[in-house]
């Protein structure tokens, strides 16, 4: 014998109170699936979570993070702080990368600089807080006559010989 | 019943201060931080300042460094921001939530329904 719940589509609940009739989800609430017995309680984005799509009598509600903080977990269960880049966040807030670190990002943790010696590179650019070093040729690569990442030396004055 | 209750919120003159109160009550405040956030009208909310468990601070905006300070009363379950130098553009309506920890808020924690701030020019 068929099930008459089974007969309820979503955006109703089969309602034993009256005689297992089809009746429409109450407000704030859903059921995403037909032949359900009770509609769920939409989810309400309370704070530093901001809805991003409203609750319907099918769908449940979802949030993001307001800005200034990102989305963790499954369905944004959890609103995390930004940095600035240049930053990791601690147990004690944002704190800047150590000397040899970086980060590009407003979330993750800073990670350290490109070490290009051990592809046998150069140093072309140096790393900041913010940014990776950037990896030259190798001193192998450079012909002659061929400019060096190296600053010129400073002109000496006239007069001063070498000593 | 876990509630959370805004308190202190009026109408200022630029330049004025306020002190608003966040009071918990139906939780073990003691491990819980507290965040300010704010809401003016046609903006996004935004984070103002946060007080941790242990009574360390974070700041969330810049622009309320050197002018908001925060700071908690375990005895009396109250966190009050204390706001000096108040401007136009603090005008907003301002709530507490109470994560266990500043830097991540869950979907669970529980929040409070806001005061109101106006400041005049």
């Known amino acids: 014998l068929q099930d008459p719940c089974s007969n309820c589509p979503a955006g109703t609940f089969c309602d034993n109170n009256r005689n297992q009739i089809c009746s429409p989800c109450p407000p704030n609430s859903f059921s995403s699936a037909g032949g359900q017995r009770t509609c769920d309680i939409c989810r309400q984005c309370k704070g530093v979570f901001r809805t991003r799509k409203e609750c319907s009598s099918t769908s449940n509600a979802e949030c993001d993070c307001t800005p200034g903080f990102h989305c963790l977990g499954a369905g944004c269960s959890m609103c995390e702080q930004d940095c600035k880049q240049g930053q990791e966040l601690t147990k004690k807030g944002c704190k800047d990368c150590c000397f040899g670190t970086f980060n590009d990002q407003k979330r993750g943790i800073c990670r350290p600089w490109t070490n290009c010696s051990l592809d046998g590179k150069s140093v072309l650019v140096n790393g900041t807080k913010e940014r990776d070093v950037v990896c030259g040729p190798s001193p192998a690569d450079l012909s002659p006559g061929a400019s060096s990442v190296t600053p010129p030396a400073p002109a000496r004055e006239p007069g001063h010989s070498p000593q | 019943q876990v509630q959370l209750q805004e308190s202190g919120g009026a109408l200022v003159q630029a330049g004025g201060s306020l002190r608003l109160s966040c009071a918990a009550s139906g939780f073990t405040f003691d491990d819980y931080a507290i965040g300010w956030f704010r809401q003016a009208p046609g903006k996004e909310r935004e984070g103002v300042l946060c007080?941790?468990?242990?009574?360390?601070?974070?700041y969330y905006a810049d622009s309320v460094k050197g002018r908001f300070t925060i700071s908690r009363d375990n005895a009396k379950n109250t966190v009050y921001l204390q706001m000096t130098n108040l401007k136009p553009e603090d005008t907003a309506v301002y709530l507490c939530?109470?994560?266990?920890?500043?830097?991540?808020?869950?979907?669970?924690?529980?929040w409070g329904q806001g005061t109101q701030v106006t400041v005049s020019s």
């Open positions: 007080i941790s468990s242990s009574g360390g601070s974070t």
């Open positions: 939530g109470a994560p266990r920890d500043c830097s991540r808020y869950s979907s669970d924690d529980y």
